[in-house]
Interface confidence: low
Amino acid sequence: LIQERRSHEVNPAAHLTGANSSLTGSGGPLLWETQLGLAFLRGLSYHDGALVVTKAGYYYIYSKVQLGGVGCPLGLASTITHGLYKRTPRYPEELELLVSQQSPCGRATSSSRVWWDSSFLGGVVHLEAGEKVVVRVLDERLVRLRDGTRSYFGAFMV
Amino acid sequence: LIQERRSHEVNPAAHLTGANSSLTGSGGPLLWETQLGLAFLRGLSYHDGALVVTKAGYYYIYSKVQLGGVGCPLGLASTITHGLYKRTPRYPEELELLVSQQSPCGRATSSSRVWWDSSFLGGVVHLEAGEKVVVRVLDERLVRLRDGTRSYFGAFMV
Amino acid sequence: LIQERRSHEVNPAAHLTGANSSLTGSGGPLLWETQLGLAFLRGLSYHDGALVVTKAGYYYIYSKVQLGGVGCPLGLASTITHGLYKRTPRYPEELELLVSQQSPCGRATSSSRVWWDSSFLGGVVHLEAGEKVVVRVLDERLVRLRDGTRSYFGAFMV
């Protein structure tokens, strides 16, 4: 594939931010703010938590999530998985793109200890028009939202 | 706003590195090396710790800081905040852009245990000409500088 | 240096993924998958673990490694170093570009505790044609490979 950056075209880019509605508890991907504050879409669209590609090419995709808690709640997995996943019409299941596993609870030596951790992912992937990228965190109960600066999701064509 | 990448224009980019003078202890932002070693400025300028935008557009901005210590010094907050902040003529206060909170001290179970941690932030934001971006770390006493490779700050237009 | 992005040229980019052969145990850099799955090379080449630059310019280079273990093996350094290094024909030794140090073992308070951590590095550096960039992790015994999504290495011209 030859991908050229035309000088007269706007380069697709987006930055979506965490909001109170991001965590659904439904087992689905995180949802994002697309318009308010620092959030924007330029040459990409959004649907139900997903960045939707309108122009095929190589994209640097990234996400950060802010994790935090007090000790480790009972029943909470000791491993937190934060990942970027692709949904494509050509394949029935989500495909892992970039994934991190962390054990932040292990930092808290007493059950009442407050802890914070952050997970950042970024990398270049090829995306076709119509393909979607989503962010998932398992267990999402540890994601700490505030003002859109601590948990976010974005992409730009390279 | 339509932002075009003109084929004859240099794309703004910068990478600033940590130096002995980075930590001022004054409550201000971190200061950076702009010329020596790996540091450079291309189409961006620098003033008192800030990357200064000369051309409006969307920028991927990033920073990494190396944290480290021996146990947790008394009086040291258990939470470290590392953030990228915008200063704009249109608003009197700094605006949070990208922020992380971490509790690295919690890893050291004894007071004499040496620990290291790293915090990385990156994301796309829109910046107008004249706006400035700075890096802050609270508590900056935990930032470990060496040779410019472990703590740094940069940006490029996307 | 004036670096122009010509509208008719393909912008160099690459994303290399971790594979079973990545960890050599030889003290050398990590090796990477260049073709299968998510891996690709576009305007860059690869040799013995290194991304090789064919066109001089400023590149955003990045790497993530997935770390994990059960407690801390005897003889294992308490500090893990993850770095991107440059090899240049003009200098006999590797040059540190971007480096992180972490103490993930410190999270595990008992010797049988499973822990996970992730290290991400990214930043803009200038690279000449013929120069090479490699990833090193010390101690690489803690790098956990799976399917190319958890440990990776990439770059693109900015």
Partner: antibody, heavy 122, light 107 residues
Framework: QVQLQQSGPELVKPGASVKISCKAS????????IHWVKQRPGQGLEWIGW????????KYNEKFKGKATLTADTSSSTAYMQLSSLTSEDSTVYFC???????????????WGQGTSVTVSS | DIVMTQSHKFMSTSVGDRVSITCKAS??????VAWYQQKPGQSPKLLIY???TRHTGVPDRFTGSGSGPDFTLTISNVQSEDLADYFC?????????FGSGTKLEIK
């Protein structure tokens, strides 16, 4: 120069629908939000919602969900607002206006159409 | 919803005078406030955004100030063509809301 040219006055019957248009010129239509604002005589301004023509994403004031439907045709640089199930409460002037999305934080409405008067009468 | 209160429905002034029109937000909106002028039979025109930044082409006799809940539009050296309704608007959160307007009358 930037212009938003709205369609002419409408006289419609109660219960019917009406679709009013807003043709943009002098700027890149797909790079700005188009908002719609209602102004009843002698009263203030009420925000109805916006559409971003670049991706057909819409945002509505909860109060107008089900009442207003916003669409856009990028080929003609025209935004539309359809009002359904009309009652006398809908008799008023409607403005389209644009908002620059090019800054990192949202902005104000910098250019406005001349307004379209809708009269609901049997 | 954030309520923008313009307590004066009418204000009377003379040519050459200075007048201040106020607007109070029911919640903190930072400086995400705009001011619009609407002359009789016309559509609104943007005067001020980000509480204090003049829009292109707006005469410098129009000045915006304030942050948090309290905002002021000041017109110094009032001219006869300034006869109009003035509306404040917050764009800090949805739904976007406007003040009820202040009608400036020239004596």
């Amino acid at each position: 120069q930037v212009q938003l040219q709205q369609s002419g006055p409408e006289l419609v019957k109660p219960g019917a629908s009406v679709k009013i248009s807003c043709k943009a010129s002098g700027y890149s239509f797909t790079s700005y939000y188009i908002h719609w604002v209602k102004q009843r005589p002698g009263q203030g301004l009420e925000w109805i919602g916006w559409i971003f023509p670049g991706s057909d994403i819409t945002k509505y004031n909860e109060k107008f969900k089900g009442k207003a439907t916003l669409t856009a045709d990028t080929s003609s640089s025209t935004a539309y607002m359809q009002l359904s199930s009309l009652t006398s409460e809908d008799s008023t002037v409607y403005f389209c206006t644009r908002e620059d999305y090019g800054i990192s934080t949202y902005s104000a409405m910098d250019f406005w159409g001349q307004g379209t008067s809708v009269t609901v009468s049997s | 919803d954030i309520v923008m209160t313009q307590s004066h429905k009418f204000m009377s002034t003379s040519v050459g005078d200075r007048v201040s029109i106020t607007c109070k937000a029911s919640q903190d909106v930072g400086t995400a406030v705009a001011w619009y002028q609407q002359k009789p039979g016309q559509s609104p025109k943007l005067l001020i955004y980000w509480a204090s930044t003049r829009h292109t082409g707006v005469p410098d006799r129009f000045t915006g100030s304030g942050s948090g809940p309290d905002f002021t539009l000041t017109i110094s050296n009032v001219q006869s063509e300034d006869l109009a309704d003035y509306f404040c608007q917050q764009y800090s959160s949805y739904p976007l809301t406007f003040g009820s307007g202040t009608k400036l009358e020239i004596k």
